[in-house]
């Protein structure tokens, strides 16, 4: 009679993570008598996957009833496959021996490859806010996918970005892979409502890519523009001066009025109005009693926005020696304004 052969008909098997892998194996003869064992790997370090005789193999079931005397089908199923199960599996026939069974013949091996979905992409932006016209970097990471081939794209408000670098690790063979990409984005004043999207496409996703997003509202700082104006006189000796703080983001803002360099009042932006682009406007006013001043008054609106160095705008009020002769509308005069940083 011809010597027993161990047939593993499948050179390779591809299984999605979470599914069950079927590893096929048949023997061509019932002789010699002895058990079948399944191993992962062929060397001395090979791992025991299933032993017909004894052992605990909770994830493994046999395809046919191995207790039947004429059974020659030694195929197994391995449940709940993960990328860590990848490797080459061998069906090995042992000959009954004393005290130990002796390895008789091995199948050619079946390589199990695992398809695993990438994790949801996580997009992270810079640690500190940046102002318009600056370039900032965003990173996108996704892990645990197999096979290695993967496509990553970046978008800003639906427009594809081209300035990015992507790495897939490791370079060599592995049970699963990770992707890391860094994109450069130039900020504009209109980006408060903008979104950066990282899109990952992989064979396991069946054409439905995964997306990770970052809101530029977490990244951008739009500094305010200031305008100080003098309102018509409310009473003969009072002038109303307003400071318009426009187009700023985020809302965190503190304003200080200075009269001739001395602090007059400090307030925090509260009742702001929101612009269509997501930036904010705010207005503060100061009532100046002109009669209390013998000389000209320099009014300064000083704004500290989001912890940045203060920005200010000044306005000069001329105090006339003969206010009655000027008329009620000219009790104070705007003689120009300037914007400066105070460090």
């Amino acid at each position: 009679e011809e010597e027993l052969q161990v047939i593993q008909p499948d050179k390779s098997v591809l299984v999605a993570a979470g599914e069950t892998a079927t590893l096929r194996c048949t023997a061509t003869s019932l002789i010699p008598v002895g058990p079948i064992q399944w191993f992962r790997g062929a060397g001395p370090g090979r791992e025991l996957i299933y032993n017909q005789k004894e052992g605990h193999f909770p994830r493994v079931t046999t395809v046919s009833d191995l207790t039947k005397r004429n059974n020659m089908d030694f195929s197994i199923r391995i449940g709940n496959i993960t990328p860590a199960d990848a490797g080459t599996y061998y069906c090995v026939k042992f000959r009954k021996g004393s005290p130990d069974d002796v390895e008789f013949k091995s199948g050619a091996g079946t390589e199990l490859s695992v398809r695993a979905k990438p994790s949801a992409p996580v997009v992270s932006g810079p640690a500190a806010r940046a102002t318009p016209q600056h370039t900032v970097s965003f990173t996108c990471e996704s892990h645990g996918f197999s096979p290695r081939d993967i496509t990553l794209k970046w978008f800003k408000n639906g427009n594809e970005l081209s300035d990015f670098q992507t790495n897939v690790d490791p370079v060599g063979e592995s049970v699963s892979y990770s992707i890391h990409s860094t994109a450069k984005v130039v900020l504009t004043r209109e980006d408060v409502h903008s979104q950066v999207i990282c899109e990952v496409a992989h064979v396991t996703l069946q054409g439905d890519p995964l997306r990770g997003t970052a809101n530029l509202s977490e990244t951008i700082r739009v500094p305010p523009t200031l305008e100080v104006t003098q309102q018509p006189v409310r009473a003969e000796n009072q002038v109303n001066v307003t400071c318009q703080v426009r187009k700023f983001y985020p809302q965190r803002l503190q304003l200080t009025w200075l009269e001739n360099g001395n602090v007059s009042r400090t307030e925090t932006a509260s009742t702001v109005t929101e612009n269509k682009d997501g930036t904010y406007n705010w207005m503060s006013w100061l009532l100046v009693n002109v009669s209390a001043h013998r000389d000209d008054v320099k009014l300064t609106c000083q704004v500290e926005h989001d912890g940045q160095p203060a920005v200010s705008k000044s306005h000069d009020l001329k105090v006339s020696a003969h206010p009655k002769e000027q008329g009620s509308n000219t009790a104070a005069e705007n003689t120009g304004s300037n914007e400066r940083n105070i460090y």
Epitope: G41, P44, G45, R46, E47, L48, G55, G87, D169, E173
Partner: antibody
Framework: DVQLVESGGGVVRPGESLRLSCAAS????????MTWVRQAPGKGPEWVSL???????YYADSVKGRFTISRDNSKSTLYLQMNSLRAEDTAVYYC???????????WGLGTLVTVSS | EIVLTQSPGTLSLSPGERATLSCRAS??????LAWYQQKPGQAPRLLIY???SRASGIPDRFSGSGSGTDFTLTISSLQSEDSAVYYC??????????FGGGTKVEIK
């Protein structure tokens, strides 16, 4: 969690014997090959011996005929019987679990064997 | 028996710097080369296998490359906790499994 705890080390004279044990937990011991690796003071690791899942044994040339590796799957314990010890056997002896592709993925903390006259 | 030669013997670098460790095999091992990290008083810990695959839980500042006989372990930005001895090991051939002599990485 995988844990490997070695015991049995100590100080012996040249020519004497010692038996090391390694108690394993946190994985199905019988399904994996196990190995002993030693490290002499200030030197790199040196592979000593391996026992496969089918109880086949392998040895480094430097210990062949003097050391015997064995396993007791019912106790999840690995052993190394060391006979005819020499000064050059002085080292920390680690037991390690081997993966199917010959990686030493988990190691014990080691047990010190000193052979000195 | 495959002999693994590591260089340099010692590498002294500052935190944040890039460390490049080399391992050369006396004959080809394909991509079957692993790297281990050993800190004083501890057992070696598997870092990299199959030349470039990171073991479970290993930070991505550790990366491996190479095939055949020449291999490199790179630590992209050294941290104080990376101070250790690093060993390469071939897992291509059957016993004996051989290790390199090690490279000591010191943080200035």
């Amino acid at each position: 969690d995988v844990q490997l705890v070695e015991s049995g080390g100590g100080v012996v004279r040249p020519g004497e014997s010692l038996r090391l044990s390694c108690a394993a937990s946190g994985f199905t011991f019988s399904n994996f090959a196990m190995t002993w690796v030693r490290q002499a003071p200030g030197k790199g690791p040196e592979w000593v011996s391996l026992v496969s899942v089918t109880a086949t044994t392998y040895y480094a040339d430097s210990v062949k005929g003097r050391f015997t590796i064995s396993r007791d799957n019912s106790k999840s314990t690995l052993y190394l019987q060391m006979n005819s010890l020499r000064a050059e056997d002085t080292a920390v002896y680690y037991c390690a679990k081997i993966t199917w592709n010959n990686l030493f993925d988990y190691w014990g903390l080691g047990t010190l064997v000193t052979v000195s006259s | 028996e495959i002999v693994l030669t590591q260089s340099p013997g010692t590498l002294s670098l500052s935190p944040g710097e890039r460390a490049t460790l080399s391992c050369r095999a006396s004959q080809t091992v394909g991509s079957k080369l692993a790297w281990y990290q050993q800190k004083p008083g501890q057992a070696p810990r598997l870092l990299i296998y199959d030349s470039s695959s990171r073991a479970s839980g290993i930070p991505d500042r550790f990366s491996g490359s190479g095939s055949g006989t020449d291999f490199t372990l790179t630590i992209s930005s050294l941290q104080s906790e990376d101070s250790a001895v690093y060993y390469c090991q071939q897992h291509n051939d059957w016993p004996p499994y051989t290790f390199g002599g090690g490279t000591k990485v010191e943080i200035k």
